[in-house]
Amino acid sequence: AMHVAQPAVVLASSRGIASFVCEYASPGKATEVRVTVLRQADSQVTEVCAATYMMGNELTFLDDSICTGTSSGNQVNLTIQGLRAMDTGLYICKVELMYPPPYYLGIGNGTQIYVIDPEPCPDSD
Amino acid sequence: AMHVAQPAVVLASSRGIASFVCEYASPGKATEVRVTVLRQADSQVTEVCAATYMMGNELTFLDDSICTGTSSGNQVNLTIQGLRAMDTGLYICKVELMYPPPYYLGIGNGTQIYVIDPEPCPDSD
């Protein structure tokens, strides 16, 4: 598979935001790239979000997606928002070179994202 | 060396409190045990806290220590408080069987403690 690198561990901020870079080694000159973030927990894999982008353009996730991102060359900067402690898990970056053919696929080893729920602020009376 | 087990990863609460168990395989019937918590960061190792206890009694850390703990058989339940994001690091549990002779020493592989600073609460006007 195509090589995909991502950090081993990331801590979400106290606001529930986690950012990490997903970098891939492209064998050729892809013009259309698809990036998918998968969450693995208890051997279950679920899709968190996905975006297809043209090289040199912005990543566009769906409007209701919890992900945003930017791309620069073979690097994708991903941000996941609205995370809670129960969302702690392994987040895997999947990269597909969609066009031109041939198709290349790469799967990262995953980024363990740790999320800690904040203490509620005291009521202001 | 004596075998010492501790968890690989612990998340501090949003209040900066982290707890973990340090368990040792005692070769004999020690009556006096010393437990030390060391922090390793950037290849620097510093002592966080230490306590000596008689088997069956409570652990007693110094009054100004950031650690508290309880013991049960060959298990020590350690709590570290007042942690900030900058305190993120590898916390190593060191156990020494002090009395009766012979002296035994065991060092755990370390517990990676992650700390996230909370967002400040909005001012209550």
């Epitope: 598979a1 064998p27 050729g28 894999v45 999947k94 198709y103 290349y104 696929l105 | -």
Partner: antibody, heavy 115, light 106 residues
Amino acid sequence: EVKLDETGGGLVQPGRPMKLSCVASGFTFSDNWMNWVRQSPEKGLEWLAQIRNKPYNYETYYSDSVKGRFTISRDDSKSSVYLQMNNLRGEDMGIYYCTAQFAYWGQGTLVTVSA
Amino acid sequence: DIQMTQSPASLSASVGETVTITCGTSENIYGGLNWYQRKQGKSPQLLIFGATNLADGMSSRFSGSGSGRQYSLKISSLHPDDVATYYCQNVLRSPFTFGSGTKLEI
């Protein structure tokens, strides 16, 4: 137009070597990982070997059935990929295809192993 | 190594019908699955890549679906021209194993 032309097949005796060649045109050969796949009535399609390109240090991969006997190589200046087959066996018979990472395929070359 | 289990081995259907071929894998291959069509006396042709994407020049009557360890190829409103053997393949990692093939007769 993308073209892959395999040559070098034919009749060979068991235990003897044979070298297959594949010349590519119509696409940027050096950007692609190249593979050899064979087709036989007994085993259907069977992937044999892959050679990656310069960004991947020309890494090679083989199926267990040919590891140690077959060697894949490439020459980007000639847009060519090769399969050196040693110690050929009866079960190596079939049509051998070269393929640019499974998107583009040649017409195949038939290898017959017989005494 | 990733094992591929393709079924059925053969299939007979009538013009206009819809058929489905399935491919199971021994582990999660994250959508790294291609489908090929091989007509008698011809080279294999890429049909679907990455489990769901239609290859250039292929009819939209072909569609791929699935994820994890279960994948399928659907052929809608069969044409006589669809007579071929269909193969799935793991493209996630080496060895890039093919399924055993499904021979479609119409």
